[in-house]
Amino acid sequence: MMTGTIETTGNISAEKGGSIILQCHLSSTTAQVTQVNWEQQDQLLAICNADLGWHISPSFKDRVAPGPGLGLTLQSLTVNDTGEYFCIYHTYPDGTYTGRIFLEVLESSVAEHGARFQIP
């Protein structure tokens, strides 16, 4: 039975040209994490494998940095970066947990962080 929950940074906004940290946290489970994937829509941005560490997808390596922790830092943001991002936790024995973050990249300097929320 999957008892865990993923807490994410929720709906967030950031300025064009700036950077943003995408964070997820898996709690309320003793399951062991074998790998965390970060995806934007259907594109894999990066993985963090429990054994072998971080691997940034070649097409994103200039604008994506690993961490902090199991989070992901997006740099040199453009308006095209607006959209949904997913953290996918592969665990055993529970299986897969997915968290969703919506990022809006703004032209102006009025970027504010949204509230945190949980996905069961």
């Epitope: 494998n49 072998l52 055993y92």
Partner: antibody
Amino acid sequence: QVQLVQSGAEVKKPGASVKVSCKASGYTFTSYPIGWVRQAPGQGLEWMGWISSYNGNTNYAQKLQGRVTMTTDTSTSTAYMELRSLRSDDTAVYYCARDLKSFWSGDVLGAFDIWGQGTMVTVSS
Amino acid sequence: DIQMTQSPSSLSASVGDRVTITCRASQSISSYLNWYQQKPGKAPKLLIYAASSLQSGVPSRFSGSGSGTDFTLTISSLQPEDFATYYCQQSVPPRTFGGGTKVEIK
């Protein structure tokens, strides 16, 4: 086609070291991890560890920690496994193997679809 | 480490027989279980990954099932080329293999 070609058989004295090579071809070397498995004569398969050909990170079986080093040379698409302080019970066929899934598949890794032909290492005084 | 126990350690069967090999993990590994076939003097060959996914090029007479701690490899109709040793392997860190099951001709 996709293949892994290993170096030839070795005979070593107890206490010596051995370095086995594994040359990959037919695929993008840095997109897949390489694992090492050994098999003593008449025995089963033993997981030794694996290495990311992308970032060089390694993870070794606990019983071999301190004696084994796995490395890669991306310029030649070659993986290496060095085992030190050899003992008679290290006599085995050593295999390198490529993971079924690339890092960019997003799948959890750990099953091996392409294997080298094996390298027999004999440790004897 | 997670221990993998295979049974039986050996079995005798005839061409056309249905053969079942089991693998039990000492703790739950979800579906992180792979099956290999090995013939004497050869490297192992991947048959099944993620408990039930058939590897490309492997005949459909091979199938895998199970999750958690109990897993099964089934050969629906044994062929002459299937006489070999079969190993399960769990892919939860740190990875380990079962002790093997030798399938011999009756």
